[in-house]
Structure formats: C-alpha cells, structure tokens
C-alpha cells in the first residue's frame, strides 16, 4: 500500500511540476503536507533555474549532478540521495518525509552511522570479553594477547605459552621454570645462568667482596672466615666479623712485687750475679706460691760452674740437689707446699750444713763437709738463676727434673742483700709480674696453644685407636678451639670447639671432622664461675658424648663417612693441640679462634701437664688460673 502511494505521488509530481511548472500551492497538493512541501519547493526552484529553457549554460550544467530537469526534480524528495549515511557504518538508508533513517552495521552508531562503538569500553561486556588486550577498530574490535601468551580458538581467551614444554632445551643444563607470559632459567643457589653457554656457572661471591675478612669460594657457594687468632669470630650474618667478647671476666690484676716464675716456657726468668766478701755464705729467703708439683725455684752456681745448688719442687715438696768438690747430694723433705698458699721458704748455708725452713720451721738439714762455693781472690762470686738453669746443667743433675714451674715468689732476700735492684728490673717488665689471686687449673689467655705428642693407637683394642677425652672447662670467652688433632697435611681431622650460641648467654660445643660439624651440643651455660665437665670417646666406629646435661651415642647418616676420614688420619700421624690451632688454613675448621679460659685435659686416662708439652705459648699458665673478677661496691 505504501509503495502504491509513493507511485501516485511520483506521477502527480511528473504531471504538475515537470511537464508543467508548479507554484508552491500546487506542490502542496502533490505532497499533501507542509514539511515535504517546504523541503521540496526551494530545491525545485534551484532545478528550474538550472534547466529552464534560456537559462541553461554549459557552466551551470557542469556544476549540476543531474543531466536534465526530470532527474533533478525527481531526486528532491528522496532523502537518501545523495547518501547522507556514513558509507562505512551504514547498512541501509530509509527515505522519510523530509528526513531519512540510517540503519547502522554492528559496531556503528549515530544518526548517520558516523560514530564507531568502542566495544572495549562497553560496561555490559567488560574489555569486550577479551581476557587480555581489547583492540577497538572502526566498526569492530578484536582481542589480542600479551607476549608469551597465545589466543584460544574462541578468539577471546589468552593462554600462557609454556616455553619449557615447548622447547625443552631452552635452558640448556639449567632448570626451566615457566612463569605467566615468560620463563626463567633457574640455577641452584650459588650459580648464575649464562645465556651464551645455556648453563649454570658458579658465582664467585668472593670477587663481590661478600666477606669482611677472608672468603673461600667453592662450587655453588662461599664461606666467610674471620681471623680467630686475632680475636675475631664470624657474626650471625655469616659475613661480617666481630670481636670474640668476654663472657666471664677474670681478675687479671698483677703486682710487680710478685715475680712470676713461668714467664718463659723454656728458659730462666731472672739471672743475678753476686760478688761478695769471701766470708759470705749462700742464703735465700722468699715467699713462694704455686699449685705446680714439680719445677725449679732457683739454681745457684759458682763462677766456674764447679759447684752448684738447686732448690726445686718435686711431688709438691722442697727438693735440694747440691754438688761441689766435696760432695754430691739430693734431699727432699717437708710438707707439700703446692697448695696455692704463700709459704715462707728459707735456704741458709751454715758452717757444716744447709738448713731449709718452711714458715721458719726447719724441714731439712743437709750436712756439708766444707763451704758450698769456694771463694777466689778474696771474693765469693755466685750466679743465681730463678725458675731454671743453664742448658748444660741438665745432664749434670743428680736426678733429672722438669724445670718448668708455674709459681710466684715475693719478699725475696738473696745472699742477705735484700731485694734492692731486682724490683726495679721487674717493675718495667709486665710479663714478669704475677697475678694477685690464682686458682688451681691451667689458663689459656686466648693468644696461643700448647702441643703434645700423644700416641692414640691401642694395640689391645679391635678399634685400633681411640681418643677418650675429659675436659674440665671454665671459659672466659664463648668462642675458641679447646682441643684439635692436626695432620701433617695441615688438615684438622678432629676438633672440639666452643662457639657462642644463637640463644643469648649460652654456648654450643662443636665436634668437627675437618671443616664439617659432626655434632653440636646446643645452648649450654658454660660461662659461669663453676667448672663444666665434658667427656667424649671416639674411635673409628663410634662417637660418645657426655655433658652436664646428657650422655649420648651420636649416630647420623653422615657420621660413618666422617669417622672414616678421621680413621684415615689417625692411622697416619696426628699432633695434639690444646687451646687453639697451629698455622692451618682458615677453612680447615669451623672455628679457628684461640680458647680463652681455664681448662684441664685428660686424654686416654692421662692428665695432661702443660709443663710436659712439646711446645707451649709463654702466656699459657700451666698450673694457675686467674680468679673470676668479682664486682666490688665501688668498682
């Protein structure tokens, strides 16, 4: 019906306005409404002006899109000609009464379909339904994926590309780890991935100055070390070094009036020469204090070495050996005086005897046929040696003695000459001063070691060798090597060390084979004024341990392998060190600091006497230990 109406209108328009000329009223009759008429008539007049006879010119024709009046007029009512819609965005154009309707393709909007719809911003379909990237395009959109992702067949979802599965050799010898959108070539800790060689290469952490003092790099890691011998230990961060701190302060007060007899491990502490009138006789008076049971207090001889007198201690008692042209004698007597108390000792040459008194009470009287030392040229010349004797004397002694004596003397009076001159010499030399108070035991000051040669082989036992150690310790610092067995090749097949525990104010005891800790006894309160008792037994098959808290046989997967390392070393030759380590590499043991404190050691049933050591640092006190420092009210 609608198209029929359109055809009628078209016929009327032909008849009224093209074949004839029409005015506006006649045009109103054709369209039967004002809007269309008002739209049509001005345009009709333009057509007339263009094509009416006599008005036509070539120039005008060239500006007109229509070849004749009919075409020009017929086109006026069609709102869709020329096309008002956006050609890209429209689907169809519908002519209306002086208007048009553009129907848009999907993805376009607007009266003329001139505006692209941004599907990516559609709130009802977030991101256009794309899982990653939404790309808006004129009239449409498409989804895309980020690098390392691939589009699924629905063209919306992006899936991670598993590069590790896609190219199994992508990381070479490293481990490939897939991560969203990418992959990583992973190396074990301490290794770095090399893109060129597609392999994991060891990081030389030492070249990156990771450690404060010494650094040892190894495949996959590194270890920092601190110079324990200079009093440093590794801090908790395992990189920096900190001073090994005192956990039990000791009373290290000394007095120059007290002469320390064990200043030298080997050698005389003091040498005096007397030139007195010939009527003089030998005499020595002094107060003496020691816990040592054997050693030389003083040795006196004539200027020509023909006569000598030795005042010593053996089994804790005074011993006198003498030799001159008339006689050769040895006498031991009196009470035991190695009790740590001050004992007044006097040795006096009388006309026919030598009198030895302790606390002014005679304990020995040694007969002598003549003067001890023969005067020459009207003078009695005598040499006196404290805490030792010249080396050649050793072979002349009536009974051999270990000369080393850890003790002190005070208030001495030699040859009735008082102490004048001697005190001045001692005053200047700090290491000749004796501690004011001492206790029984051996003291390791944290600056040196003692070496012993001990044969651990036990022929009667099936194990072949065994190490049974008892330690009585009272440490002063919480870190240090107490005992170490050292091989000829500078390795440490066994060590017992102390380290400050991670828990405050306590210590751990480490048992180590070479640089591996085979057992750690944790959190013991060892820094106290009470001694702690530790025992351990080790042979090629077992390791047993006894501490104040428990007794146990240690066994773990790695222990047998470590004991095999120890076994191999024990079959060769090992040296035993107390109080620290000799010059071995820092990396040879987990701890390398010297032990500081008191310690008594018994190995395989024998109490070790530091006076019997092959070598001993001078500062180690074999038979005396400083008392614990007591805080006084005004200090």
């Amino acid at each position: 019906a609608n198209s029929l109406l359109e055809e009628t209108k078209q016929g009327n328009l032909e008849r009224e306005c093209i074949e004839e000329l029409c005015n506006k009223e006649e045009a109103r009759e054709v369209f039967e409404n004002d809007p269309e008429t008002d739209y049509f008539y001005p345009k009709y007049l333009v057509c007339l002006r263009s094509f009416q006879t006599g008005l036509f010119t070539a120039a005008r024709q060239s500006t007109n899109a229509y070849p004749d009046l009919r075409s020009c007029v017929n086109a006026i009512p069609d709102q869709c000609s020329p096309l008002p819609c956006n050609e890209d965005g429209y689907m169809s154009c519908k002519d209306g009464k002086a208007s048009f309707t553009c129907t848009c393709k999907p993805g376009w909007q607007g009266e003329k379909c001139e505006f692209d719809i941004n599907e990516c911003k559609d709130p009802s379909n977030i991101n256009g339904g794309c899982s990653q990237i939404c790309d808006n395009t004129p009239g449409s959109y498409h989804c895309s994926c980020k690098n390392g992702f691939v589009m699924l067949s629905n063209k919306k979802d992006c899936k991670d590309v598993d590069e590790c599965s896609l190219k199994p050799s992508i990381c070479g010898t490293a481990v490939c780890k897939n991560i969203p959108g990418d992959f990583e070539c992973e190396c074990p800790e301490g290794y770095r991935y090399n893109l060129k060689s597609k392999s994991c290469e060891d990081i030389d952490e030492c070249s990156e100055n990771m450690c404060a003092q010494l650094c040892v790099n190894y495949p996959g890691g590194y270890t920092c070390y601190c110079d324990g011998k200079k009093g440093f230990k590794l801090a908790q961060d395992q990189k920096s070094c900190e001073v090994v701190s005192v956990c039990l302060p000791l009373n290290l007060d000394t007095k120059y009036e007290l002469l320390y007899l064990a200043e030298q491990f080997a050698g005389v502490v003091l040498y005096l020469k007397f030139r007195l009138p010939e009527i003089s006789r030998f005499s020595a008076e002094f107060d003496f204090r020691t816990y040592d049971s054997e050693g030389v207090i003083l040795y006196a001889e004539s200027i020509d070495h023909s006569a000598w007198l030795l005042i010593a201690l053996r089994g804790g008692k005074i011993e006198v050996q003498l030799k001159n042209e008339h006689t050769s004698k040895i006498t031991t007597g009196g009470d035991v005086i190695n009790n740590g108390l001050w004992n007044m000792v006097s040795v006096e040459e009388l006309e026919h005897s030598i009198s030895i008194k302790i606390a002014k009470e005679a304990v020995m009287d040694i007969n002598k046929p003549g003067p001890l030392f023969k005067p020459e040229n009207g003078l009695l010349e005598t040499k006196v040696y404290f805490a030792g004797f010249p080396r050649k004397v050793e072979s002349e002694l009536i009974k051999p003695i270990n000369p080393r004596l850890d003790g002190c003397i005070r208030s001495w009076n030699l040859m009735k000459q008082g102490a004048s001159g001697i005190k001045e010499i001692i005053q200047e030399k700090q290491n000749k001063h004796c501690l004011v108070t001492v206790e029984k035991g051996s003291y390791y000051p944290g600056s040196g070691i003692a070496q012993f040669h001990i044969d651990y082989n036990n022929v009667s036992s099936a194990e072949g060798w065994h190490v049974n150690v008892t330690l009585n310790i009272r440490p002063s610092t919480g870190t240090g090597v107490m005992l170490a067995l050292v091989s000829g090749n500078n390795t440490v097949p066994f060590a017992v060390s102390l380290v400050d525990s991670t828990s405050e104010k306590s210590q751990d005891i480490l048992l180590s084979v070479e640089n591996t800790v085979i057992y750690r006894i944790q959190a013991l309160s060892l820094c106290s004024d009470q001694q702690s008792h530790l025992e351990f037994r080790v042979n090629r098959n077992n390791l047993e341990l006894s501490t104040p808290l428990k007794i146990e046989t240690i066994s773990h997967e790695d222990l047998q392998r470590q004991l095999a390392v120890l076994d191999k070393a024990m079959k060769a030759k090992v040296a035993t060190y107390l109080g620290g380590l000799p010059d071995v590499p820092f990396s040879a043991t987990p701890v390398n600091a010297f032990y500081n404190g008191c310690m008594e050691v018994n190995i395989n049933g024998v109490q070790l006497d530091l006076d019997e050591a092959i070598s001993k640092h001078n500062d180690i006190r074999a038979h005396s230990c400083p008392s614990v420092w007591k805080k006084t009210k005004n200090s």
Partner: antibody, heavy 119, light 106 residues
Framework: EVKLEESGGGLVQPGGSMKLSCAAS????????MDWVRQSPEKGLEWVAE??????????YYAESVKGRFTISRDDSKSGVYLQMNSLRPEDTGIYYC??????????WGQGTTLTVSS | QIALTQSPAIMSASPGEKVTMTCSVS?????MHWYQQKPGSSPRLWIY???NLVSGVPGRFSGSGSGTSYSLTLSSMEAEDAATYYC?????????FGGGTKLEIK
C-alpha cells in the same frame, strides 16, 4: 568460526587397519597443532597422537599404547589431519576426537567419529 | 608417566550447594586444565592454566591448586552444571587425563 569434522570411523576386525580424517576450517590451519584424543567407557579420555605445525617441523608424538601402530599426518593445503591406524586391537575401540591444540591444552574438539574393533 | 586421580568419581548436589572436586597428581606439575562434557557432546575446555575460566563459563566456577593437588569448585550448583568434568595435564611430551568426576543434580 572454528569447525572440526571427523570421518572414517566404523567397524573393523582386530589386526585390521583404518584411516580417520579431520577436516578443519575457521582458523589458520598451517599454524595449528592438531591432536587425536579418544574416549571409551573403560579408559575414559585418552590422548592418542599429536602433530605440530610447520614451524615445529611437523613433529609427531604418540601415546605409548599406540606407538608403532598409529601414524598421524597432515595436509596443510587441504586443512586436513589424518590418523592411520594399523594392527588394531579391541582396546582401540572408542570415539576418536580431532582437536585443535593450543599451548598444551585441547582448545576445540570435533564431534567425534566412532571406531569399533571387533570380530 | 604422570597419573591423574579424580575424586569423587560421582557426586550429586542440590541447587545452590557448593561443590568441590579434586585432581591428585602422581608428581608435581605446573598447570592443570579442566574440561566439561555433557552426554552426547564433545568435551569443552572449561578452565585453563589452573584457575582461568574460558570466556562464557559462569563465574560460579573456579579452579585452584599447585604441585600435586588441584581442585575445581562450584560456588552454587545449578541444573545446567550437571556434567562430567575432566582434569588434564601435559608433561614430557605426554598428555594425561583424569578419570573424570560425574556431577549430578539432586
């Protein structure tokens, strides 16, 4: 729109042979990895074979149970993937699906074709 | 070969009920994919890379897990969710599927 259409299924005797075809459309076939997955009530879903794209040298992979008996092939010019099955066994019975595989998952599945191996 | 074990094999749930099904792996894998299959139809990719829902999959579905344990969870069961769900992984040039969990509506 992605379309996968399997054909070639049917009844075959044990020891016999059969060739399955899969016609693909709606995606760039030459870039795609194509797989065959089968389903049976006894074994459930079971991956059979995979053929990768030209970029991956048309590499082929097979399930242990079909190795040496089945051959997967493709014709990129025809957008087709094929499964030649020899020495068939009763346990090969099931619905065979052709799949478009994207990054190690079965992104799109055809409707399937049924293979029955029975005497 | 890595084996996938789905549990339970069959389960039923009332509308609105929360549902969880699991997929245990014999050795650790990086990703798990899930498929939905309704009777008479081909399986459809449902969840990929452990937790990503395929476009058009209702938000009441979710996936999670890592290493050797993965799960698919449905926060509120609806009738249209009744189907069999399969888990799948790829490792060492082999694809493996779980035995499936059949989810029925009560």
């Amino acid at each position: 729109e992605v379309k996968l259409e399997e054909s070639g299924g049917g009844l075959v005797q044990p020891g016999g042979s059969m060739k399955l075809s899969c016609a693909a459309s709606g995606f760039t076939f030459s870039d795609a990895w194509m797989d065959w997955v089968r389903q049976s009530p006894e074994k459930g879903l079971e991956w059979v074979a995979e053929i990768r794209s030209k970029a991956n040298n048309h590499a082929t992979y097979y399930a242990e149970s079909v190795k040496g008996r089945f051959t997967i092939s493709r014709d990129d010019s025809k957008s087709g993937v094929y499964l030649q099955m020899n020495s068939l066994r009763p346990e090969d019975t099931g619905i065979y699906y052709c799949t478009l595989t994207t990054a190690f998952l079965f992104d799109y599945w055809g409707q399937g074709t049924t293979l029955t191996v029975s005497s | 070969q890595i084996a996938l074990t789905q549990s339970p094999a069959i389960m039923s749930a009332s509308p609105g009920e929360k549902v969880t099904m699991t997929c245990s792996v014999s050795s650790s894998v990086s990703y798990m994919h899930w498929y939905q299959q309704k009777p008479g139809s081909s399986p459809r990719l449902w969840i990929y890379d452990t937790s990503n829902l395929v476009s058009g999959v209702p938000g009441r579905f979710s996936g999670s897990g890592s290493g050797t344990s993965y799960s698919l969870t449905l926060s509120s069961m609806e009738a249209e969710d009744a189907a069999t769900y399969y888990c799948q992984q790829y490792s060492g040039y082999l694809y493996t599927f779980g035995g499936g969990t059949k989810l029925e509506i009560k």
